[in-house]
């Protein structure tokens, strides 16, 4: 057992042209925080694969607001180290992902908004107990400078933290299965540790870092069932054989999901939806904290500093479940409007729009008026997937082909009489009123209540209100 420690020294624009824009603004102040994910070995693993060695989240950094016109400086960082405890042996070779996250503090509905600013990844060799190693990684125009080390937690020692000795519980014996720890005969050897992530139900090991599967299970971590009928040969020490599940009519018969997990059938097997605090193929792994990196697919773990307090995974778009382990069928929500075809690309949603529509969700009506003319000087107005004509005076109907009676709407106010005219309509006003629609009363002193003259006209110029 031990701790991997990460110290972030700086995060800011890298050298060279094309300095990035500041991630924060006066309108949207923000602060940074970091997430580290560790995996054993040097294999090229997908970013979504579990952080088998562990993960950690930093505290939030100071609130930062961009100074207008200033280039993006190194951004203020959270205090302290990121610490990833590991319970098993330190593997010596490991892969890391360090993510820089931005928390926007503007007026967000439902709390602050998080967005991933930069992600760097690498593979390194590192012996536990050695000095701090310094590193620089670039992600686009950003540069991250950091140091890291692995150290063993007492009583563990060695480059892999596998020399695990602890004081004897009694002077005469070490307890069942535990031998005196040579050359320190006054101490006892502590239990063996297997490959990180090895299933505690279906896997076992007899050498540090290995993961051997019980009968009926396979995969590097013994989490994949071979079949439901593998009750054949003995395996394991001292002629011990494994037990077997007797298949019922359906894979969920008897509910194979432990700890309150709910079972759902899949085409080839079953899937457990685990309550918070449990994970694994059958929800069999418990005592999970954020340090265990339980949030998959880039989910952010919050809370859960110790096994008795629940953690919460905040899932990125496209994933759901208590551990962000399930991919959302985002197209089932039918986000594409106006008959657009939905494509879930994993990292993003795309809508393939029908002709005449555009926009991320096909929400924009491109040109309803194409090939559709409005008669008699009418103008075409787009909207809603169908064209509409705004007709010239004296015409109406869908295409402005019908001659309209301009007086039908009784446009003359205060008892004025309406006359149709070749250029529109004329109102003959009742005594005491004036204006194109007889809308202005004439005051007894002779002054009118005409509106102020529009720009470009002097009071007293003739005005037409047609």
């Amino acid at each position: 057992a031990g701790v991997f420690e990460l110290q972030i020294h700086s995060f800011g624009p890298g050298p060279g042209p094309g300095a990035p824009r500041s991630p924060c603004s006066a309108r949207l102040p923000c602060r940074l925080f970091f997430r580290v994910c560790l995996k054993p070995g040097l294999s090229e693993e997908a970013a979504e694969s579990p952080c088998a060695l562990g993960a950690a989240l930093s505290a939030r950094g100071p609130v930062y607001t961009e100074q207008p016109g200033a280039p993006a400086p190194d951004l203020p960082l959270p205090d302290g180290l990121l610490q990833v405890p590991f319970r098993d042996a330190w593997p010596g070779t490991f892969s890391f992902i360090i993510e820089t996250w931005r928390e926007e503090l503007g007026d967000q509905i439902g709390g602050p908004a998080w967005s991933l600013l930069a992600r760097v990844a690498g593979r390194r060799r590192l012996a536990a107990g050695g000095p701090w190693a310094r590193d620089i990684q670039r992600a686009g125009a950003w540069e991250l400078r950091f140091s890291y080390r692995a150290r063993c937690e007492p009583p563990a020692v060695g480059t892999a933290c596998t020399r695990l000795c602890r004081p004897r519980s009694a002077p005469s014996r070490c307890g069942p299965g535990l031998r005196p720890c040579a050359p320190l005969e006054d101490e006892c050897e502590a239990p063996l540790v297997c490959r990180a992530g090895c299933s505690p139900e279906h896997g076992f090991c007899e050498q540090p870092g290995e993961c051997r599967c019980l009968e009926g299970w396979t995969g590097p971590l013994c989490t994949v069932p071979v079949s439901t009928s593998s009750c054949l040969s003995p395996r394991g020490p001292s002629s011990a054989t494994t037990g077997c599940l007797v298949p019922g009519p359906g894979p969920c018969d008897g509910n194979p999901c432990a700890n309150g997990g709910s079972c759902s059938e899949t085409p080839r097997s079953f899937e457990c939806t685990c309550p918070r605090g449990f994970y694994g193929l059958r929800c069999e792994v418990s005592g999970v904290t954020c340090a265990d990196g339980p949030c998959f697919n880039g989910g952010l773990c919050v809370g859960g500093a110790d096994p008795d307090s629940a953690y919460i995974c905040h899932c990125p778009p496209g994933f759901q479940g208590s551990n962000c382990e399930k991919r959302v069928d985002r197209c089932s929500l039918q986000p594409c409007r106006n008959g657009g075809l939905c494509l879930d690309l994993g990292h993003a949603l795309r809508c393939r729009c029908r002709a005449g529509f555009a926009g991320p969700r096909c929400e924009h009506d491109l040109d309803d008026c194409a090939g559709r003319a409005c008669a008699n000087g009418g103008t075409c107005v787009e909207g809603g997937g169908a064209h509409r004509c705004s007709c010239a005076l004296g015409f109406g109907g869908r295409d402005c082909r019908e001659r309209a009676d301009p007086c039908a709407a009784r446009p003359c106010a205060h008892g004025g009489r309406c006359y149709a005219h070749f250029s529109g309509l004329v109102c003959a006003c009742a005594p005491g009123y004036m204006g194109a629609r007889c809308e202005f009363p004439v005051h007894p002193d002779g002054a009118s209540a005409l509106p102020a003259a529009p720009p470009g006209l002097r009071p007293g110029d003739p005005q037409r209100y047609l």
Epitope: P200, E201, F204, L214, P237, V285, G287
Partner: nanobody, 127 residues
Framework: EVQLVESGGGLVQPGGSLRLSCKSP????????MGWFRQAPGKEREGVAA????????LYADSVKGRFTISRDNSKNTLYLQMNSLRAEDTAVYYC????????????????????WGQGTLVTVSS
């Protein structure tokens, strides 16, 4: 501190049955393996049966397969070993063992897997 208390041992004739119980009065074990082990006079301790609490896996030594059944009553926080068709070679002190937290080190019928043990109950099969 986790305590495991076995009971149910005694003298039984060959072909008879016994049911051993193992209760944890101080701690609720909600996940991880629990097992039954036995040690006959002058012999090494051997794994008899194991069960994964919170899961569905049970394992048996070849010598007891088909005769012994391991089970667990979560509501009573008790582990059981039902022993049928007992033979003279089943005579031994039977120990209950538990993991405090699940981990994959060692085979479930390997005593090194377990960090908590009961004091044992004697089973004698004799005519």
């Amino acid at each position: 501190e986790v305590q495991l208390v076995e009971s149910g041992g005694g003298l039984v004739q060959p072909g008879g049955s016994l049911r051993l119980s193992c209760k944890s009065p101080t701690y609720t074990i909600s996940s991880g393996y629990m097992g039954w082990f036995r040690q006959a006079p002058g012999k090494e301790r051997e794994g008899v049966a194991a069960i994964y609490i919170g899961g569905s896996t049970t394992l048996y030594a070849d010598s007891v397969k088909g005769r012994f059944t391991i089970s667990r009553d979560n509501s009573k926080n008790t582990l059981y070993l039902q022993m049928n068709s007992l033979r003279a070679e089943d005579t031994a002190v039977y120990y209950c063992a538990a993991q405090l937290r699940p981990n994959s080190a060692y085979h479930p019928l390997d005593g090194r897997k377990y960090n908590y043990w009961g004091q044992g109950t004697l089973v004698t099969v004799s005519s």
